[in-house]
Interface confidence: low
């Protein structure tokens, strides 16, 4: 005697989030009479997905008309798939009765949802660092499925190799997250540099997602200081110049000290940018030589970006 078979031809089906999934099921016999039901999972905790007999299943549509007596196609279409729909679906034939009795189950079809990773978010260090130091950048992306994913780091188009990546969770899940930390050695020329985190995933059709961070947010380029004296003017005044060069960011306070006493304090603002993104600033101080008996010790004191002050001193000779 030919036995009823419930055939689920596909062992697995992969669908992109937002699309519809078709789960195929064929019953090889019209007898015994009884409904077909679809479940996700097995055992007492299984979830009813669709029943010919009863219930309201707004996202599930039978592919063929189940009211047709000779219908043996019990395939269903689930619309607007989300990662939460992932799992193994079973097509189950029941014999009509009070209550209906489970007769036969198909082998199951595993539905995997291809969910795109979220746009990678790159975050840099909390505090700035200077050239030659290594800083860490973290890239995070969430909500993707399947688990296989490729992450690369670039600095100005050049691939980086010093990074560590984790995909969580380690076991099976409806969706996954990736977190990667790259170590980047800063150079003085990095004000205009960018780090890019590039995530490639089957859902992206070869068009990877990128997250960027500007190294300008992470770098501090300390200034060079040079104090020079211009020639004495006819009115016995000497012009002393403090050149502060190649610094970044712009936040800088300059204080002139005459023999240890504060003479003037200035704040840098609206400076033009150098080619490499750094800034230069020049401050002048006029010293009235005739008002002094002894040599005048001038100090240019620069406090850059909240760092300890850097001094450069210069002695203005007062001839007897």
């Amino acid at each position: 005697e030919e036995e009823l078979q419930v055939i689920q031809p596909e062992k697995s089906v992969s669908v992109a989030a937002g699309e519809s999934a078709t789960l195929n099921c064929t019953a090889t016999s019209l007898i015994p009479v009884g409904p077909i039901q679809w479940f996700r999972g097995v055992g007492p905790g299984r979830e009813l997905i669709y029943s010919q007999k009863e219930g309201h299943f707004p996202r599930v549509t039978p592919v063929s008309d189940p009211t047709k007596r000779n219908n043996m196609d019990f395939s269903i279409r689930i619309s607007n798939i989300t990662p939460a729909d992932a799992g193994t679906y079973y097509c189950v034939k029941f014999r009509k009765g009070s209550p209906d009795v489970e007769l036969k189950s198909g082998a199951g079809t595993e539905l995997s949802v291809r969910a795109k990773p979220s746009a990678p978010v790159v975050s840099g260090p909390a505090v700035r660092a200077t050239a030659e130091h290594t800083v860490s950048f973290t890239c995070e992306s969430h909500g993707f499925s399947p688990r296989d994913i490729t992450l690369k780091w670039f600095k100005n188009g050049n691939e980086l190799s010093d990074f560590q990546t984790n995909v969580d969770p380690a076991g099976k899940s409806v969706s996954y997250s990736i977190r990667s930390t790259a170590r980047v050695v800063l150079t003085r020329r990095d004000v205009h540099s960018q780090v890019i985190c590039e995530v490639a995933h089957v859902t992206l059709q070869g068009d990877p997602l990128r997250g960027t961070a500007n190294l300008s947010e992470a770098i501090r380029v300390p200034p060079f200081l040079e104090v020079t004296q211009q020639s004495m003017r006819a009115d016995n005044q000497v012009n002393v110049t403090c050149q502060v060069t190649k610094f970044y960011p712009q936040r800088l306070q300059l204080t002139w000290l005459e023999n240890g006493n504060v003479s003037r304090t200035e704040m840098a603002s609206a400076l033009p940018e150098n080619k490499d993104g750094t800034y230069n600033w020049t401050s002048w101080l006029l010293v009235n030589v005739s008002a002094h008996r002894d040599d005048v010790k001038l100090t240019c004191q620069v406090e850059h970006d909240g760092q300890p002050a850097v001094n450069k001193s210069f002695s203005v000779k007062v001839s007897a």
Epitope: K155, N156, G157, H192, S193, Q194, I196, N214
Partner: antibody
Framework: QVQLQESGPGLVKPSQTLSLTCTVS??????????WEWIRQHPGKGLEWIGY???????YYNPSLKSRVTISVDTSKNQFSLKLSSVTAADTAVYYC?????????????WGQGTLVTVSS | DIQLTQSPSSLSASVGDRVTITCQAS??????LNWYQQKPGKAPKLLIY???NLETGVPSRFSGSGSGTDFTFTISSLQPEDIATYYC?????????FGGGTKVEIK
């Protein structure tokens, strides 16, 4: 030896967007060695620097044009592009693309031959 | 923006003459200055970079000097093929700017 070639329409109507592409051959645009820039020259006049792009995507635009300019790069095609929106007759010029070195020679040592764009209805 | 004032705006000299063009910056630009030659209908050509360095392949009769705000471009012995407009360009500050140009003609 690197060569640059501008391409795009020679006539643009006022208020429309001027779009030009510069194709680079004989060198990789994704090399971190250069800035890729656009410069224009109004008829019979001097040169005006428009802006540049770095392989990382970093851009800098001349503030006088900033609100209207977009420079982008397509490393897969070895091209970079200029878009200038809301054009007027004052944007009629020869537009040059050029390559500027980051190390060694800082000058724009390689230029396209230039393309004349006329803004007229 | 940095202003570059080139002078003269045009000059006429004889073959073999020494020709000098000056470029004055509105503020200190160190040696971040280039000199270009542009012949009619052609793209500019880099001659001098960093104020005084001769670009590869450029004849030695061309030279540049200066630093800070005052720069000089010299053709030691003018040749017929030197008929062109010459531009200085600063790259010390963004945006880059060019001088107004000097048109060199032969008497």
């Amino acid at each position: 030896q690197v060569q640059l070639q501008e391409s795009g329409p020679g006539l643009v109507k006022p208020s429309q967007t001027l779009s030009l592409t510069c194709t680079v051959s004989g060198g990789s645009i994704s090399s971190g060695e250069y800035y890729w820039e656009w410069i224009r020259q109004h008829p019979g006049k001097g040169l005006e620097w428009i802006g540049y792009i770095y392989s990382s995507g970093f851009t800098y635009y001349n503030p006088s044009l900033k609100s209207r300019v977009t420079i982008s790069v397509d490393t897969s095609k070895n091209q970079f592009s200029l878009k200038l929106s809301s054009v007027t007759a004052a944007d009629t010029a020869v537009y040059y693309c050029a390559r500027e070195g980051l190390d060694g020679s800082y000058g724009s040592s390689a230029w396209g031959q230039g393309t004349l764009v006329t803004v007229s209805s | 923006d940095i202003q570059l004032t080139q002078s003269p705006s045009s000059l006429s000299a004889s073959v073999g003459d020494r020709v000098t063009i000056t470029c004055q910056a509105s503020q200190d630009i160190s040696n971040y200055l280039n000199w270009y030659q542009q012949k009619p209908g052609k793209a500019p050509k880099l001659l001098i970079y960093d104020a005084s360095n001769l670009e590869t392949g450029v004849p030695s009769r061309f030279s540049g000097s200066g630093s800070g705000t005052d720069f000089t471009f010299t053709i030691s012995s003018l040749q017929p093929e030197d008929i062109a407009t010459y531009y200085c360009q600063q790259f010390a500050y963004l945006p880059y700017t060019f001088g107004g140009g000097t048109k060199v003609e032969i008497k």
